[in-house]
């Protein structure tokens, strides 16, 4: 017979020869990192038809790392389903907990023994320090010193000393999130008041108010014979300015060769612009949309 077969999990005892006589026996042993479990044979004989009798390495099993329990408030997941060396053990924590230690352990061979590459990690409860205090405002649970995962606080602004109230800029509610950090930056309390929006040759059609505070929204239309240059809708932003800026109502050019000043809309524009009140969706001037409006 020629050289005996080779296996992944077992190796020949002694040196292999180029040729073997009929009836000659060769013995195998489990390779390093594997151990033998009977009853499968670990030898073979050169048969009279010059082939080796059937043999396999199925009696050699990989060395296994010790079983690791799920961490408290977490889970250990075997990446390839067994504890044999070469295995990966992935650790995850339950919601509201974070991992202290390595999130992956590897089953490694040390000499002939399979051991894990490190200590299993722990799952600790996510805790946040108190959220920031803010000027001219406060948050709920201000007496609490430690916050747990998903604990939320709500900010509110103090009454203003003057005639205009403080506006809350940002998120009013924030919660203790992953990485023990708050979900958003603390908001700001300040007076935000935009100027009265004056549009010559036009008028406000919605968003009427005594004063215009944070996020107040106003819409305009132009008089007949004028068109809107800019946006018909503006919002009072945190820096006390209108965004987009207060529009202008510009006179319609009746000459077909003269271009009206550019409007804020993109794309090609006609050289003659009809008055805004002729656009679809705009009330006609004689419809008296402001009559009998309750603010």
């Amino acid at each position: 017979c020629e050289a005996p077969p080779t296996f992944e999990a077992m190796e020949l005892i002694g040196k292999p020869k180029p040729y073997y006589r009929v009836g000659e026996r060769v013995d195998y042993k489990c390779k390093k990192g594997y151990f033998y479990i009977p009853p499968l044979a670990t030898h073979t004989i050169c048969d009279r038809n010059h082939t080796w009798l059937p043999v396999s390495d199925e009696g050699c099993y990989r060395e296994m790392c010790p079983h690791i329990r799920d961490p408290l408030n977490g889970e250990a997941i075997l990446a390839n389903g067994s504890y044999e060396f070469g295995a990966e053990l992935h650790f995850i924590c339950n919601e509201g907990y974070y991992l202290i230690g390595k999130d992956i352990l590897y089953c490694e061979l040390k000499d002939t023994v399979a051991i894990w590459s490190g200590k299993p990690p722990l799952c600790e409860k996510i805790l946040c320090t108190p959220p920031p205090k803010i000027k001219n405002g406060k948050h709920t649970f201000s007496e609490v010193e430690v916050f747990e995962y998903l604990d939320a606080v709500t900010y509110s602004c103090d009454p203003a000393p003057g005639p205009d109230p403080f506006s809350l800029i940002g998120e009013s509610m924030i919660y203790c999130g992953n990485n023990s950090t708050w979900s958003h930056a603390a908001p700001e309390c300040k007076v935000v008041k935009c100027r009265f929006p004056v549009v010559e040759n036009g008028k406000q059609i919605s968003g009427f108010g005594k004063k215009f505070y944070y996020k107040a929204t106003v819409m305009f239309e132009c008089d007949k014979g004028y068109y809107l240059n800019g946006s018909d809708k503006i919002v009072c932003e945190s820096n006390s300015t209108w965004d987009p800026p207060v529009p202008k109502c510009l006179k319609v050019s009746t000459s077909p060769t003269t271009k009206s000043p550019t409007s804020s809309a993109s794309g090609p524009r006609p050289t003659y612009k009809p008055p805004v009140s002729n656009y679809p969706g705009y009330p006609k001037p004689d419809e008296g949309i402001l009559n009998n409006l309750d603010d």
Epitope: K203, Q204, L293, D295
Partner: antibody, heavy 118, light 107 residues
Framework: EVQLVESGGGLVQPGGSLRLSCAAS????????ISWIRQSPSRGLEWLGV???????NYNSAFMSRFTISRDDSKNTAYLQMNSLKTEDTAVYYC????????????WGQGTLVTVSS | AIQLTQSPSSLSASVGDRVTITCRAS??????LNWYLQKPGQSPQLLIY???SLHSGVPDRFSGSGSGTDFTLKISRVEAEDVGVYYC?????????FGQGTKVEIK
């Protein structure tokens, strides 16, 4: 609290010109929106125009061609330049601080009398 | 321009009376209406802004109401110091305009 004082009124012939001044004390004229308003027995109260803090202006179109509002920050004074004056322009002229950017008038001065007569 | 028409043009009341002055706009002005009082020999003074908000220092016997085109100024118990000419003013649209005035006298 800013105080506005009007001056420059007087007798002027029809067709003549006059420049009224509005001097600010206790504050900067450039920090406020300044309106000019006039009052006469025949025409009542009439708003003439405004100069905003950013230097922009709006006018009552009835006076736009003859009246101009300006401001000199170095002199801390706002002005109303009136040209081609008519007898019906005879009135008390007030400069008025627009209330905190809102068109209500809470700060009236004593006004200055302009008489247009030959 | 938006016209404001006040009525009555003048009225005479006794101290303690309730006085009502109306202001009608030629088109809807939402609540963008102010009221002023010009006492004899003085400059006008702001009483009420945005239809019903009392300016600082104004006694609470003054009140304003209305919306759209019809507005009212009420003095619940008129006093001698309330004599003068009352003006309304709109500011929804340029030019900002005033009513012709209502003269209030004390009997």
């Amino acid at each position: 609290e800013v105080q506005l004082v009007e001056s420059g009124g007087g007798l002027v012939q029809p067709g003549g010109s006059l420049r009224l001044s509005c001097a600010a004390s206790g504050g900067s004229v450039s920090s406020y929106d300044i309106s000019w308003i006039r009052q006469s027995p025949s025409r009542g109260l009439e708003w003439l125009g405004v100069i905003w803090t950013d230097g922009g202006t709006n006018y009552n179109s009835a006076f736009m061609s003859r009246f101009t509002i300006s401001r000199d920050d170095s002199k801390n004074t706002a002005y109303l330049q009136m040209n081609s004056l008519k007898t019906e322009d005879t009135a008390v002229y007030y400069c008025e601080r627009v209330y905190d950017g809102y068109p209500w008038f809470a700060y009236w001065g004593q006004g200055t009398l302009v008489t247009v007569s030959s | 321009a938006i016209q404001l028409t006040q009525s009555p043009s003048s009225l005479s009341a006794s101290v303690g009376d309730r006085v009502t002055i109306t202001c009608r706009a030629s088109q809807g002005i939402s609540n963008y209406l102010n009221w002023y009082l010009q006492k004899p020999g003085q400059s006008p003074q702001l009483l009420i802004y945005y239809t019903s908000s009392l300016h600082s220092g104004v006694p609470d016997r003054f009140s304003g109401s209305g919306s759209g085109t019809d507005f009212t100024l009420k003095i619940s118990r008129v006093e001698a110091e309330d004599v003068g000419v009352y003006y309304c003013q709109q500011y929804i649209k340029l030019p900002w305009t005033f009513g012709q005035g209502t003269k209030v006298e004390i009997k």
